[in-house]
């Protein structure tokens, strides 16, 4: 969480941002809130990015003003116009690109004063893994697949019964480049699995951590997946 204040003493307002991550090729949100003003026409929101000459986005007098917008953001940004009046300056970002990563500044002007806060935005790819029993294999085998990751993640297997066991000798992980030549499909195979046990396939890079669980018994198979972003720090 980053909390910024205006520089000019009593003419300062609090602006709060939250570091976040964008999934490339999908739509993202850069979070920013501020002390609200009662009059929409008095509120100016400017989003800037370090190293970028033009603005990322500008909202003033109750509408977008995009004449100074940098070309790389054209047609890709919006604020939640109906929520600006209650202090929400968060930015929607369409079709997140790797190059969108960096330091952003949310700069606010209201009748009460000015304020700003920075936000670190990471970009990459992350997806939910699915673990299945591989019936084509010669021995009892589990197959963990996740369609889109970047940068290349690590994959670790764990089991409920053999807690702390190292499965690297009985697993094999491969990374296959997807058609857009950036993200990769993750496939990890675990051999010699035993019945009546819960196995977890954990995929992690510096942006996200995802886990796929599978419980195999003689009568049924239960699956569960979970994904967590790692860098959501507020400012």
């Amino acid at each position: 969480l980053i909390i910024g204040f205006g520089i000019s003493g009593r003419h300062s307002i609090t602006v709060t941002t939250v570091a976040s991550a964008g999934n490339i090729g999908e739509d993202g949100i850069l979070s920013c809130t501020f002390e609200p003003d009662i009059k929409l026409s008095d509120i100016v929101i400017q989003w800037l990015k370090e190293g970028v000459l033009g603005l990322v986005h500008e909202f003033k007098e109750g509408k977008d003003e995009l004449s100074e917008q940098d070309e790389m953001f054209r047609g890709r940004t919006a604020v939640f116009a109906d929520q600006v009046i209650v202090g929400n300056a968060s930015l929607r970002l369409k079709n997140v690109q790797l190059t969108d990563a960096g330091t952003y500044k949310c700069y606010i002007i209201t009748s009460k004063g000015k304020g700003n806060a920075n936000l670190e935005y990471k970009t990459g790819a992350f997806s939910m893994p699915e673990v299945n029993v591989d019936y084509n294999a010669s021995s009892e085998t589990l197959r963990c697949e996740a369609p889109r990751w970047f940068p290349q993640p690590t994959v670790v297997w764990a089991s409920q019964v053999d807690q702390g066991a190292n499965f690297s000798e009985v697993s094999n992980t491969s990374f296959e480049l997807n058609s857009e030549n950036v993200t990769m499909k993750v496939v990890s195979v675990l051999y010699n699995v035993t019945i009546n046990n819960t196995y977890s396939c954990m995929i992690e890079n510096d942006i996200a951590k995802a886990t796929g669980d599978i419980k195999v018994t003689e009568s049924e198979i239960k699956r569960r997946s979970h994904l967590q972003l790692l860098n959501s720090k507020a400012s």
Epitope: L66, S67, E71, G75, A78, N95
Partner: antibody, heavy 119, light 107 residues
Amino acid sequence: QVQLQESGPGLVKPSETLSLTCTVSGGSISSYYWSWIRQPPGKGLEWIGYIYYSGSTNNNPSLKSRVTISVDTSKNQFSLKLISVTAADTAVYYCARVYNNYDWGFDYWGQGTLVTVSS
Amino acid sequence: EIVMTQSPATLSVSPGERATLSCRASQSVSSNLAWYQQKPGQAPRLLIYGASTRATGIPARFSGSGSGTEFTLTIRSLQSEDFAVYYCQQYHNWPLTFGGGTKLEIK
């Protein structure tokens, strides 16, 4: 109520330049993006390009560098120029307003003008 | 560029029934998709944007769904004025591209 009206010649000779103007009434040309879209007879829609009131533009690469879109805010107009036309450029040409900066659907359209490329 | 494919090319449905039109993108466009209706001799009319949000003045019988690569426009209880050509359009990436259209005709 915003209204758009295309104007320009209905017949252009091959290798010459197609020029069309879109006049916007019932609202300001400022603070919206504006586009040209075309539709060959009996076929689908093709996006040509856009312009913002500040002059920022972007064109469809399929038309290479044959397209120029310009704006005249004092007249509430924007224009299309397409050079070196061929019979394949025969189409109904529409001007349209982009719904907003994020949702690039087209909410207001002109009625369209048929431009035939023929000698 | 992102290629938009609509199916079927022609759909025959009786008035009062439901019509389901499909649109597929060659890669994910998230929810950045619009639907239009076009009648002969007229400009297209925006029905849906954001894959599922109805544009101003569009009747509730029109609904859009889907995200990623698969999208559907559903028209329930078809009225005589609904028979037209329908186009989908992605605005996830440049250039903006349209589907080839689905002609909805009276059965």
